[in-house]
């Protein structure tokens, strides 16, 4: 079995302020079992945007039904985009761990740019 890869096909996306951003991410394997998380930025100061396993993320919806059998699409939509949302977003696969899940592999990132609303 080939090792899982996290594919973020869009290097960048441009969204108008007030609109919804779609950030695409797919995994290439069902193995290992474990959730996906989305972050803005990299390194220790990265900001958690969405966690499949737990948490409340009112601006974020998933494109696919995560409970769908054999789902490997972890794309998200972020609503009501503002200039403060600009940055590089990473889709990160975790593998099931005990007691905590362990980061396994990250996508290459998608840069979100925000176009100001015309005044």
């Amino acid at each position: 079995e080939e090792e899982l890869q996290v594919i973020q096909p869009d290097k960048s996306v441009l969204v108008a302020a007030g609109e919804t951003a779609t950030l695409r991410c797919t995994a290439t394997s069902l193995i290992p079992v474990g959730p996906i998380q989305w972050f803005r930025g990299a390194g220790p100061g990265r900001e958690l945007i969405y966690n499949q396993k737990e948490g409340h993320f009112p601006r974020v919806t998933t494109v696919s039904d995560l409970t769908k059998r054999n789902n490997m699409d972890f794309s998200i939509r972020i609503g009501n985009i503002t200039p403060a949302d600009a940055g590089t977003y990473y889709c990160v696969k975790f593998r099931k761990g005990s007691p905590d899940d362990v980061e396994f592999k990250s996508g290459a990132g998608t840069e979100l740019s925000v176009r100001a609303k015309p005044s």
Epitope: E1, L30, V33, G34, E54, D65, T67, R69, N70, K96
Partner: antibody, heavy 119, light 110 residues
């Protein structure tokens, strides 16, 4: 971490119904399937049914389709399994189990609820 | 429905020796390159514990003396060097369609 806490032991008369609960914590309840499995004394495991808490989609073992009903309460992250028209051979430990990979498997288990059916 | 048949029903193995449990499906449990077989360990008075998923992948925290193999209809759980704490009943389960379990194999120390 993931925890599934089940309701206490029950003693029921033949012909009665029982409703077993399974309270989930440590994860987003609506993102993962819940399975129900039973085990009669000294016997093997028997899959009853599964439910997707996000939309209440259910799949039943044909053997239980007419007597078992699965429900969830997303406000309390609790899953329920009701079994009707109880018979003595329904005496068993009833387990709930969470499917962490949408593979129709059982990654995390409750401790079980003993249901005794006796006149 | 796919029926899973485990063999043997019971097995006694010396400490440090290899234990092998088989699981045969009545039809293929493979789909899209994956083998939908899972192995569980159950000790007395406890719920089952997932050991192996998708035929050959060790679950988190499971010692690497456990391994799974096979494809199509024939699958094997192997414990390379039996430890006292491995005494339990072992079950295979498929999810090619709706889940079913094998009847279980009781593993004891010789």
């Amino acid at each position: 971490q993931v925890q599934l806490v089940q309701s206490g032991a029950e003693v029921k008369k033949p012909g009665a119904s029982v409703k077993v609960s399974c309270k989930a914590s440590g994860y987003t309840f609506t993102n993962y399937w819940i399975n129900w499995v039973r085990q009669a004394p000294g016997q093997g495991l028997e899959w009853i049914a599964m439910i997707d808490p996000s939309d209440s989609e259910t799949h039943y073992n044909q053997i239980f389709k007419d007597r078992a009903t699965l429900t969830t309460d997303t406000s309390t992250s609790t899953a329920y399994m009701e079994l009707r028209s109880l018979r003595s051979d329904d005496t068993a430990v009833y387990y709930c189990a969470m499917d962490y990979g949408s593979l129709y498997a059982m990654d995390y288990w409750g401790r079980g609820t003993l249901v005794t059916v006796s006149s | 429905d796919i029926v899973l048949t485990q063999s043997p029903d019971s097995l006694a193995v010396s400490l440090g020796e290899r234990a092998t449990i088989n699981c045969r499906a009545s039809k293929s449990v493979s789909s899209s390159g994956y083998n939908y077989i899972f192995w569980y360990q159950q000790k007395p008075g406890q719920p089952p514990k997932l050991l192996i998923y998708l035929a050959s992948n060790l679950d988190s925290g499971v010692p690497d003396r456990f391994s799974g193999s096979g494809s199509g209809t024939d699958f094997t759980l192997t414990i390379s060097s039996l430890q006292a704490e491995d005494v339990a009943v072992y079950y295979c389960q498929h999810s090619r369609d709706l889940p079913t379990f094998g009847q279980g194999t009781k593993l004891e120390i010789k």
